[in-house]
Interface confidence: medium
Amino acid sequence: RGVFRRDAHKSEVAHRFKDLGEENFKALVLIAFAQYLQQCPFEDHVKLVNEVTEFAKTCVADESAENCDKSLHTLFGDKLCTVATLRETYGEMADCCAKQEPERNECFLQHKDDNPNLPRLVRPEVDVMCTAFHDNEETFLKKYLYEIARRHPYFYAPELLFFAKRYKAAFTECCQAADKAACLLPKLDELRDEGKASSAKQRLKCASLQKFGERAFKAWAVARLSQRFPKAEFAEVSKLVTDLTKVHTECCHGDLLECADDRADLAKYICENQDSISSKLKECCEKPLLEKSHCIAEVENDEMPADLPSLAADFVESKDVCKNYAEAKDVFLGMFLYEYARRHPDYSVVLLLRLAKTYETTLEKCCAAADPHECYAKVFDEFKPLVEEPQNLIKQNCELFEQLGEYKFQNALLVRYTKKVPQVSTPTLVEVSRNLGKVGSKCCKHPEAKRMPCAEDYLSVVLNQLCVLHEKTPVSDRVTKCCTESLVNRRPCFSALEVDETYVPKEFNAETFTFHADICTLSEKERQIKKQTALVELVKHKPKATKEQLKAVMDDFAAFVEKCCKADDKETCFAEEGKKLVAASQAALGL
């Protein structure tokens, strides 16, 4: 892995097994298989993993043994293609098995499903979970990896090992506690929420690499690492970017063993060189490997060096701007991005990338002009509106959030986004708008200097969820346009969308607004989702409904649910009062 490629290992599978150790090797192979074959039963995957592990051990013993020289893609792909029910379960994905590597792996990757048709994970009683944990800890933890990986086919594999370690620690501690539930449930809730966030963040990284290419990912990484490590030199940041890009390219490409191995190497490099990277790494670097890598990924921004010179000197006033740009465009733009980002931890990464794009466009135009310097002299003035737009948007939305609270703020966004893109499926609109609404409690509490990086970069992650879900079944040209034209302008693109005047309102269907007594036993969150689903449907039926009209109907709906859940004969109440509610709502909305 040097600057010069060493002789390749005789057996790649033996090399990775030795580097990672048996436990991590097995866990990563299970994650890889579950992310590819998302519908296969747990037992089938465990069997495949055990077969691969036994084979790897023979290669460790003798790297020259038969098939040990095959690539990991060949070995894993061959193993996946032995699944007997491939055609029945996965349909056309079975055609991948007729292809040769590397086309076969690409084919498997294309069939990863961001929204697989799998039952929701229901959490058993605490005693049931603790018994299962004690009866067979290994199987219990493998099941966790399997269930998460198949539902999140782009989950960052080495990070999932970290989650599994915390999951195990939670059960180890809490199953011995006096009040098991009080100990365990908050920990599981925290892991679930963090896991969803981690999955969504990684999904954006993979989308960036796969849809917009390595250059886009590297630009993102330069900006983010320069904010985080402002004391590091450009060459050091560049090296970290190259290494990080390799790690994420591997994980997004299904090369999970290589990814985990290289991530460990990168953590080692960062900790060995922390003096030239950041003063904030000391605590992270004292932790064990999985915690260390996670800690580094989340580490706070280092302090900015004092007395950084003005950017204008090198990037506007210098006579060599066009010469330097022409010499090595990406290196020069990388230096610009590095210098700008290390000075602006208060900007979102996507804003920094918009500024760099504006700078690049200006140089492209001006370096071909008669008087380049005159042409690009005012380039920094063009940045002002780009900076003010997210600042103003965040200010307005934080004010709205503080006024409404999270649930009603989510509802405002539900209405806003349903009017923008009413063709999108109701579950997707509910999921995405609820997540967009969480930006309030996540970011509005921060001081001004931290609001924008928190809010806009979080919104990029959430809007990517919309983009990947919509890509599976495209229904809106407007969504496709905002998702595909520019990665860094997705949020401004969606913000700029007005009500879709071409939308033909959905036919009214009373069944959509028929509720039953089961709503009473739901958790508060589930009840909110039911109400928000109804709200989206209302807007789809009546896109021109005013805020006041919708509020009146939703208030009636809340009162109806509360009344019937207190009734002795709940089901009869829901049936009779429900009819009245539907009629009243139709009248209120003029349907």
């Epitope: 040097g2 600057v3 060459a235 090296k239 970017v241 290494d243 990168l266 330097n324 090595a328 290196v331």
Partner: nanobody, 126 residues
Framework: EVQLVESGGGLVQAGDSLRLSCAAS????????MAWFRQAPGKEREFVAG????????RYIDSVKGRFTISRDNAKSTMYLQMNSLKPEDTAVYYC???????????????????WGQGTQVTVSS
Amino acid sequence: EVQLVESGGGLVQAGDSLRLSCAASGRTYSRNAMAWFRQAPGKEREFVAGIDWSSENTRYIDSVKGRFTISRDNAKSTMYLQMNSLKPEDTAVYYCAAGTSWGALASRLEAAYSSWGQGTQVTVSS
């Protein structure tokens, strides 16, 4: 981090030849571009020649084109600079550099390189 060590410098007459070597040890992850830079007394360090990972792309400054040849042997982790028809103005300390590999291959910009050797002195007398 990667370590680079240059060798092969020395004192020669104008018109003679020299072959510089740059041996790499340690590691970095990616396929790196590599280059030779030089710094003459009282002058700034300047790019001389660069080569990409696969040796497919090489580039030179105009003043050495046709006289210098850059090459690399990945199996030996070594890069070379064959210098023929040396001139007094080639006198300088020659540095070997390993690039960060993102952006232009074998860039002429110093900032594109993350690892540097200590340098080897080349003196050409007339």
